[in-house]
C-alpha cells in the first residue's frame, strides 16, 4: 500500500514565500493530485492546486505555481503578504490527496511548524486512507 508524504518549507530569505511538497512512495499509478489547506482563511478546507498527469495543473491564490517534481511527487509554491503570512500560517495544515490505481485515495496532512526540512523519511502527521 503506498504511503503519502508531505513537507512544507519556508524560504529562508523570504518569509512570505514557501512551498508544499508531497509525494507517494512505492509503486502506484497516479491519476490526480489535490493540494489543499485548512485553517488558513477560515475553518474550511481551501483548495490550492490540482495536478493531472496529462491535462496539466491548475492553482488558486495564494498558490503561485504548481508542478510535478517527479512522476510521483508534486510541489506547490505559495506567496502572500509578510504580515498575513506570519499571522495566518500558525494554525494552517496542508493536505495532499493522491488518487491512485488500484489503491484509491490517499491523503496526508502536515502542519507548517511540524515540518523538518532535513527529514529523510516520510512521517505524515495525519494519514487518512479511503479506498
Amino acid at each position: 500500500s503506498p504511503e503519502v508524504w508531505v513537507q512544507v518549507q519556508m524560504e529562508a530569505t523570504n518569509l512570505s514565500s514557501f512551498s508544499v511538497h508531497c509525494g507517494v512512495l512505492g509503486y502506484s499509478l497516479i491519476s490526480l493530485v489535490t493540494v489543499s489547506c485548512e485553517g488558513f482563511v477560515d475553518a474550511g478546507r481551501t483548495k490550492l492546486a490540482v495536478l493531472h498527469p496529462e491535462f496539466g495543473t491548475q492553482q488558486w491564490a495564494p498558490a503561485r505555481q504548481a508542478h510535478w517534481e517527479t512522476p510521483n511527487s508534486v510541489s506547490v509554491t505559495l506567496t502572500m503578504g509578510q504580515s498575513k503570512a506570519r499571522s495566518s500560517l500558525a494554525n494552517t495544515t496542508f493536505c495532499c490527496e493522491f488518487v491512485t490505481f488500484p489503491h484509491g485515495s490517499r491523503v496526508a496532512c502536515r502542519d507548517l511548524h511540524r515540518s523538518d526540512p532535513g527529514l529523510s523519511a516520510p512521517t505524515p502527521a495525519l494519514n487518512l486512507q479511503a479506498d
Epitope: I30, P53, P71
Partner: antibody, heavy 123, light 106 residues
C-alpha cells in the same frame, strides 16, 4: 547547463558497502530529483531509485529496497548512493542522472547523466 | 512492476538503411516513454522523450511514435555514428528500462 560529475572507481570486498557521489554544477540542484541507474558488464540499464534534494526523500526500486540508501547534501550540491551487503553481481557502472520534465505534466526523462562510476566487487 | 520488452535485441544494418526498433510495455503507459542511445564506455544519451518529442540537438532522422503499450523508434537513414545500443524507458510508474537493442554494422 547542469553537469553531473561522479566519484572515481571503487574496488570492494563482498559483504562491504560502497558510497558513490554525484556533484551537480552549473544549475539549480535542489529543485530536480537525482536518479541512480546501474549497468552490469554487457547488460542493460537498471533504475535503482531517486531523491528530491530539497526535501531529502528517496524512492527506491523494489529490487534494491533495504540495501540502497540515496541521500543528498544541498550545501555541496551532491547526491550520494550507498549500496550495502555487496556481492559479485553488484559489479557494475553506476550512473547518476537528473530527472528532467516540463513540470506541468507528469512526463519525466533522464538528462543529463554523470560519466559513471565503476564499482568492482571481488574477493 | 511494468516490464518493458524491446525487439529485436540486436540487428545488423547498413549506412542509409531505415531502422525500426519496437518497445512493448506490460500495461498501458500512455505516452510516458523515452528513448536513449548508448555507445560503449559512455553514459546513455536522451534521444526522444514523451514518446515522440525530439530532444534538442538530436538529428531529425530519429523519430518516436506510439502510445499505450506499443512504441517505435525509427532511424530514417542510418549514419555511421548511429551504430550503438538503444534503450526505451517508461516513466509512468517509477522507471523501468527495456533490455536494449544493439544496432551493428552489416
Amino acid at each position: 547547463q547542469v553537469q553531473l560529475v561522479q566519484s572515481g572507481a571503487e574496488v570492494k570486498k563482498p559483504g562491504s558497502s560502497v558510497k558513490v557521489s554525484c556533484k551537480a554544477s552549473g544549475g539549480t540542484f535542489s529543485s530536480a530529483a537525482i536518479s541512480w541507474v546501474r549497468q552490469a558488464p554487457g547488460q542493460g540499464l537498471e533504475w535503482m531509485g531517486n531523491i528530491i534534494p530539497i526535501v531529502g526523500i528517496a524512492n527506491y526500486a523494489q529490487k534494491f529496497q533495504g540495501r540502497v540508501t540515496i541521500t543528498a547534501d544541498e550545501s555541496t550540491s551532491t547526491a550520494y548512493m550507498e549500496l550495502s551487503s555487496l556481492r559479485s553481481e553488484d559489479t557494475a557502472v553506476y550512473y547518476c542522472a537528473r530527472d528532467t520534465g516540463r513540470g506541468y505534466t507528469r512526463h519525466f526523462w533522464f538528462d543529463p547523466w554523470g560519466q559513471g562510476t565503476l564499482v568492482t566487487v571481488s574477493s | 512492476d511494468i516490464q518493458m520488452t524491446q525487439s529485436p535485441s540486436s540487428l545488423s544494418a547498413s549506412v542509409g538503411d531505415r531502422v525500426t526498433i519496437t518497445c512493448r510495455a506490460s500495461q498501458s503507459i500512455s505516452s510516458y516513454l523515452n528513448w536513449y542511445q548508448q555507445k560503449p564506455g559512455k553514459a546513455p544519451k536522451l534521444l526522444i522523450y514523451a514518446a515522440s518529442s525530439l530532444q534538442s540537438g538530436v538529428p531529425s532522422r530519429f523519430s518516436g511514435s506510439g502510445s499505450g503499450t506499443d512504441f517505435t523508434l525509427t532511424i530514417s537513414s542510418l549514419q555511421p555514428e548511429d551504430f550503438a545500443t538503444y534503450y526505451c524507458q517508461q516513466s509512468d510508474i517509477l522507471y523501468t528500462f527495456g533490455g536494449g537493442t544493439k544496432v551493428e554494422i552489416k
